[in-house]
């Protein structure tokens, strides 16, 4: 029951996280800035991974998409790539985890298959979360290092004088959404991986067993070793040779002609 709860909770947390990563990637407010020197009105500029917007105090907003790839900083391209990889991995992870959920029965899918799928989706969620956190952190670092306070450089261009407009860049809402979403996806992935351990089938309990014959007249029955899997002749999973079965953890006797495993 605890395994099902852990798996279900991991799925829900990851789902929320991936939804957040998608939202952050689409948002325009990755960086925000006030244009201090505007002589007309208060102007607020905010930009995301895909477009830049200017909002005036009158309420007018104009957005322009980054149609050119040449003028974009390499870091911005890297952030775009990280976020998209995060979304794709997360989406695949969600698809896999739906089929892996213990509460959902699909044909005669074994627990071992569900365990493997849970582990796979968990790893995908972890990588997805890390991609989102990395992407947001790279962008934040780009703001801090390059754009925190642009200096008022003045130089003369072909058409007259040019100077950099003094603007203060700050972290936009999308950065915080991205960090939280990435963290949630990461936590969800870890929960899925933990749930995977509990989903692993119990057949391993009888795999490492040495059978010691108690008498010279006892013969080996092929169905005995397969009892735990339910595929042998002993289909009711009754242990054969109870008196002589010992796990490898126990002290073992020296091999003799009566040891069959």
């Amino acid at each position: 029951m605890a395994v099902t709860a852990c798996q279900g909770l991991g799925f829900v947390v990851s789902l929320i996280g991936i939804a957040g990563i998608i939202a952050a990637t689409c948002m325009d407010q990755w960086s925000t800035q006030d244009l201090y020197n505007n002589p007309v009105t208060a102007v607020f500029n905010y930009q995301g991974l895909w477009r830049s917007c200017v909002r005036e105090s009158s309420g007018f907003t104009e957005c322009r998409g980054y149609f050119t790839l040449l003028g974009l900083p390499a870091m911005l391209q890297a952030v775009r790539a990280l976020m998209i990889v995060g979304i794709v991995l997360g989406a695949i992870g969600l698809l896999v985890s739906i089929f892996a959920l213990k509460c959902i029965r699909i044909g005669s899918m074994e627990d071992s298959a569900k365990a493997n799928m849970t582990l796979t989706s968990g790893i995908m969620f972890i990588v997805s979360g890390l991609c989102a956190i990395a992407g947001v952190s790279v962008f934040a670092n780009m703001l801090v290092t390059n754009f925190w306070m642009s200096t008022a450089n003045m130089y003369t261009g072909m058409g007259g004088m040019v100077q950099t407009v003094q603007t203060r860049y700050t972290f936009g809402a999308a950065l915080f959404v991205g960090w939280v979403a990435g963290g949630l996806t990461l936590i969800g992935g870890v929960m899925m991986c933990i749930a995977c351990r509990g989903l692993a089938p119990e057949e391993t309990n009888y795999k490492a067993v040495s059978y010691h014959a108690s008498g010279h007249s006892v013969a080996y029955k092929p169905g005995g070793f397969k009892a735990s899997t339910g595929f042998g002749s002993n289909t009711k999973n009754k242990k054969i040779y109870d008196g002589g079965a010992r796990t490898e953890d126990e002290v073992q006797s020296y091999p003799s002609k009566h040891d069959y495993v």
Partner: nanobody, 122 residues
């Protein structure tokens, strides 16, 4: 490379009219505010009028009611219609624009034109 090219200046009699125009050209990504400043001999450069992309305007007190600023966003061009000109309007008129270039979509630059001479004299 971005260029601001002013035109329409010249000699005019007091009470006359002139229409200045300024076209921004080059690798422009986004323009915010465009405006006109003027500098009379021996004086500091002062704002005449400015207009944002959304159409919000600001005029200096000395030109209110006489000058009208307008803008064509599609052509990246700003106009200044000057009526009832006075001798004290004589100055070099500079076009100004806050913009981002395609080569750096994260930084705003303030570009200035070379200026056009307006002389009001009888």
């Amino acid at each position: 490379q971005v260029q601001l090219v002013e035109s329409g200046g010249g000699l005019v009699q007091p009470g006359g009219s002139l229409r200045l125009s300024c076209a921004a050209s080059g690798s422009i990504f986004q323009i915010n505010t465009m405006g006109w400043y003027r500098q009379a001999p021996g004086k500091q450069r002062e704002l005449v009028a400015a207009i944002t992309t959304g159409g919000s305007t600001k005029y200096s007190d000395s030109v209110k009611g006489r000058f009208t600023i307008s803008r064509d966003n599609a052509k990246n061009t700003v106009y200044l219609q000057m009526n009832s000109l006075k001798p004290e309007d004589t100055a070099v008129y500079y076009c100004n624009a806050d913009l981002k270039t395609n080569s750096n979509v994260f930084t705003w630059y303030e570009y200035w034109g070379q200026g056009t001479q307006v002389t009001v004299s009888s």
